[in-house]
């Protein structure tokens, strides 16, 4: 028997309740932002909650439907992109998710000017990506992996590609490991600002190996999936940039772009583009040993209607503590000059920071320091340069917004949100219209979310987008739990933690406690953001105390524990979770008889090797969809942080650093162990073969798959997973259901 | 090169006005700002004040506000500090110098020898 | 106006040592900026928007900090780094303000 405290104090309290685990699973305590769909400097396009499109101007005050909701739902639109020269709408239905950012779509053209669809020369479908140019009404699409470009709408499609093949060459289209682990997007092409030109990437996946996996659906045979997927060591795509004149694409045709020489010696990557002029282009690329990043801005000769690319454009950045840059490597925000930009790369002491880069990287100007991280920058004007930093009170785990005057007069640093809420708003993001002349913020947290209007040049609120209201009420009656973030130092070492309490906590009792983590490389937990989660309901009802902890290898703290991983991931995370768990049990109100650990993706590698390090320390654990072994892993993301599965390389750590390797070790521990079938990112393969040393190491476990679906184990499948991850744990922590 | 020439003394009697002057060469004076700082014999630096030559606007440190005037003879390329009813306090070396703005330097990147002014009866 | 509090007034090194020398503004600055000055000459820039080199000074020579709390650093103390360095900065501006100044003596 449990005996609880009786919680009758006063009746307010009385009137409180616990979260509860449907609260969490209906997403009864979730959370809106506002990010505004800019259209110039002063007007933005919103999706009304009855979806209308509305177009609001700031400095009118005025508003107006450009598009109703009964011509959304002719077409059972639920996404929509207004041309820039405001005569079109294409409407987006028919969405099918593919892989991370990727999906397909049908797409129709809507005329703003006659109230019509366009017909004639309708587009195909489905359509794997399609934009607007940046000025006028010029439409590119990707269809069947071959880039498409009509002048107006409805024009007969000019086919740019005529390669693009299922699996083997993508035209405008990243295939599975560029969307995922370097690009980031759904998409592989790029106009210039002014719409002259569309530059875009080949994809030859020709000799990737393949992973297959079974899709069980509802048919009498399984079908099998395909995705051309380098692991760890593997062959990698071969990637090429091309630049077309959307002018006259017949005239020349596309036009390749050349690889730096230093590039081009051995495997490489392209990382990613940007235009600076309509006449000049920015490409990045990446050795395939990812410490080495050449940026290479090349220029357009009319003359010969190529692109140049001179060896004096050229600026590398190297790292000679761990691999370039933080996840990515950062891409540059270029000057009114059009020569001189902005990046974030680690400054001498390394920490990243503002570099201002003129002519080379060697006389690159830094324009942030200290020991903290600039993060983001958001934009640059004549006049200012807006970017995110954690250097307000020196808590890492925050995000505040920056402006640094650069204009005819001292530079000069203002935070702008470090005040605005101080107690809510601790985690911002910011979206800017044109020349920031006006600009949106957005609050995470910790406290409930807020998104508001700002004046560019003043800062000035102009109004609140979204304030959460029926959250904040719905929130008034339920006992949230505490949270504290806080630092433990351990040999030189500074561990940032979030501890979740119960509502009631007590530091005179022992509690449950939970480990909650990812530890990834460059990721970070420890956040000031509001969040009701499972978590949240762990504490607030079921009592448990539940931590994250920041440990080496995580971001925005310096390289020194960024970089601590490179090449050993799987020891320095796991470590470091095992000597917070020691620090949380001398603070005395840990039941150190009941803690457990859990974490999905890299998350569920570190959870399972934490249950397998014979600390004694953990009762039981969850890992859900972890790696196993980092061989079989996706090489961009692999081999940044670990170099190759060779044995003049790497390859004995490959080996060492197995979930496979430490089975014996499962013996006194709870297990439970869970996948996706059909996960294309961390493949079902990697639980298999943990399944496996385990039953052939003779240790008893608990294991859970889900068929059918993928990384993310979405819709009835979350509902049946926390469910059951909450008995597990309800179970090993002798709580009564 | 870039050189910013100065007198070397200056002797001015108590209550007298003495006009320093800062001849630019190598660049034309009317380019950048000019700033004037004082140094006392074994003491810090002290701002005085700055003239932008293009246009003849000036700042001055509240402290030099009257004592100080700033000038720009931009046909000889030379910039002058007028220093009126001196006193023993005002006996120090006063440089010129000019601040590199172009972006993100912002420092004073050139600096005249200085002029020693002694202010004795 | 902003003060700035530079320490220790004057300190002495031995070659080879590190050196670490202080500035405190009384209210937080965006940026520091360093002068190195010695006898009978005229002030040198050294560091600008507080980490940046100045043309021509020795790598050995570092700027830091943020807010209130900046410092200049010389890896490895040489003969020729015996002078008097000055901070400096804009954020009050106008007036600009200098520290009043660090000696540093070669041991």
């Known amino acids: 028997i449990v005996l609880r405290p009786s919680r009758v104090h006063n009746s307010e309290e009385n009137t409180m309740r616990a979260l509860t685990l449907k609260d969490i699973l209906n997403g009864t305590f979730s959370y809106k932002t506002f990010f505004p769909n800019w259209i110039s400097g002063q007007e933005y396009l919103h999706q009304s909650a009855d979806n209308n499109i509305v177009l609001y101007n700031i400095e009118t005050g005025q508003s107006y439907t450009i598009l109703s909701n009964r011509t959304m739902k002719s077409v059972n639109a639920s996404n929509y992109g207004l041309s820039p020269d405001r005569q079109f709408v294409y409407l987006e239905s028919d969405y099918s998710k593919l892989w991370r950012y990727s999906y397909t779509a049908t797409y129709y053209i809507y005329d703003l000017s006659n109230g019509e669809f366009v017909r004639g020369n309708e587009l195909p479908r489905p359509i794997q990506y399609l934009c607007w140019s940046p000025v006028g009404s010029k439409l590119a699409y990707v269809y069947q992996n071959n880039i498409y470009l009509k002048q107006r709408p409805g024009d007969p499609p000019f086919q740019i590609t005529f390669n693009g093949r299922e699996n083997k060459i993508f035209n405008g289209i990243p295939d599975w490991v560029y969307e995922e682990e370097m690009l980031a997007t759904k998409y592989a092409l790029w106009w210039s600002p002014n719409g002259k030109f569309l530059a875009y990437a080949e994809f030859n996946d020709t000799d990737i190996p393949v992973i297959a996996y079974s899709y069980y659906g509802d048919e009498q045979y399984p079908r099998t999936i395909n995705i051309p997927y380098p692991k760890a060591g593997a062959k990698n795509p071969v990637v090429r940039i091309f630049i077309i004149d959307t002018t006259y694409p017949a005239y020349v045709g596309p036009q390749e772009v050349p690889v730096p020489a230093m590039i081009a010696s051995s495997d490489y990557y392209f990382s990613w583009l940007t235009w600076v002029t309509d006449e000049r282009v920015c490409l990045q690329w990446l050795k395939r040993v990812q410490n080495v990043s050449v940026l290479s801005i090349c220029d357009f000769r009319e003359d010969w209607q190529t692109w140049d690319c001179p060896k004096t454009q050229e600026h590398i950045e190297e790292s000679r503590t761990g691999w370039a840059g933080g996840f990515f490597v950062s891409t540059p925000v270029f000057s009114y000059d059009a020569i001189s930009y902005y990046k974030i790369f680690s400054d001498k002491d390394g920490y990243k920071h503002i570099h201002y880069i003129k002519d080379t990287v060697e006389n690159a100007i830094q324009i942030t320091s200290g020991k903290w991280e600039a993060i983001n920058i958001f934009r640059v004007t004549q006049d200012s340069l807006f970017y995110s930093s954690n250097e307000f009170e020196e808590y890492p785990g925050r995000r505040n917004i920056y402006r640094i005057s650069i204009g005819s007069y001292p530079p000069s640093k203002k935070c702008v949100t470090c005040h605005l809420r101080k107690e809510r708003c601790q985690y911002y993001t910011a979206s800017f219209s044109d020349y920031a002349k006006y600009y949106a913020l957005v609050c995470y947290g910790p406290g409930i979310p807020i998104s508001t209007l700002h004046d560019g040049r003043t800062d000035q609120e102009i109004k609140i987008l979204e304030e959460n209201k029926e959250l904040e009420n719905a929130l008034k009656n339920i006992q949230l739990p505490k949270e504290e973030i806080k630092k433990l130092e351990v040999d030189e070492i500074t561990l940032w933690y979030k501890m979740i309490l119960p509502p009631q906590f007590d530091r005179s009792k022992k509690y449950p406690l939970l480990i909650q983590v990812y530890g990834g490389p460059c990721s970070q937990s420890v956040r000031s953001v509001f969040a009701v989660n499972w978590i949240s309901y762990l504490a607030s009802k079921e009592g448990m105390v539940i931590a994250l902890v920041d440990g080496r290898g995580t971001a925005f703290q310096g390289d020194k524990l960024l970089y601590a991983v490179y090449r050993k991931l799987g020891v320095y995370e796991v470590e470091d979770q095992i000597t917070a768990v020691r620090k949380f049990i001398e603070m005395g109100f840990i039941d150190e008889k009941r803690i457990a650990i859990w974490g999905w993706s890299y998350g569920g590698y570190v959870s399972s090797l934490a249950l397998a390090s014979g600390t004694g320390l953990f009762k039981c654990g969850i890992a859900v969809a972890p790696v196993s072994s980092w061989e079989y892993y996706a090489s961009v993301y692999t081999e940044r942080f670990m170099g190759l599965p060779t044995k003049d390389d790497n390859l004995e750590h490959y080996k060492n650093s197995t979930v496979m390797a430490r089975a014996e070790y499962f013996r006194n521990v709870d297990y439970l162990l869970i996948h996706g079938t059909a996960d294309d990112n961390v493949h079902f393969q990697n639980s298999a073969q943990i399944a496996k040393a385990l039953v052939n190491a003779q240790v008893d476990f608990q294991a859970m798959w889900y068929s059918d679906q993928n990384h993310g184990l979405s819709g009835l499948s979350t509902n049946h997973l926390y469910t059951h991850m909450t008995h597990f744990l309800k179970q090993c922590f002798s709580l009564s259901d | 090169q870039v050189q910013l020439q100065q007198p070397g003394a200056e002797l001015v009697k108590p209550g007298a006005s003495v006009k320093l002057s800062c001849k630019a060469s190598?660049?034309?004076?009317?380019?950048?700002?000019l700033h004037w700082v004082k140094q006392r014999p074994g003491q810090g630096l002290e701002w005085i004040g700055e003239?932008?030559?293009?246009?003849?606007?000036?700042n001055f440190s509240e402290k030099f506000e009257i004592k100080a005037t700033l000038t720009v003879d931009s046909s000889s390329n030379t910039a002058f500090m007028q220093l009126s009813r001196l006193t023993s306090e005002d006996s120090a070396v006063y440089y010129c110098?000019?601040?590199?703005?172009?972006?993100?330097?912002?420092?004073?990147?050139?600096w005249g020898a200085g002029t020693t002014v002694t202010v004795s009866s | 106006q902003i003060v700035l509090t530079q320490s220790p007034a004057l300190m002495s090194a031995s070659p080879g040592e590190k050196v670490t020398m202080t500035c405190t503004a009384s209210?937080?600055?965006?940026?520091m900026y360093w002068y190195q000055q010695k006898p009978r000459s005229s002030p040198k820039p050294w560091i600008f928007?507080?980490?940046n080199l100045a043309s021509g000074v020795p790598a050995r020579f570092s700027g830091r900090g943020s807010g209130t709390s900046f410092s200049l650093t010389i890896s490895s103390m040489e003969a020729e780094d015996a002078a008097t360095y000055y901070c400096?900065?804009?954020?009050?501006?106008?007036?600009?303000?200098f520290g009043s100044g660090t000696k540093l003596e070669i041991k």
């Open positions: 110098t000019r601040l590199d703005d172009s972006r993100f330097h912002w420092y004073f990147d050139v």
């Open positions: 928007l507080t980490s």
């Open positions: 209210s937080s600055v965006s940026y």
């Open positions: 003239i932008n030559p293009a246009n003849g606007d000036h």
């Open positions: 190598g660049y034309t004076i009317t380019s950048y700002s």
């Open positions: 400096q900065q804009w954020s009050g501006y106008p007036p600009i303000t």
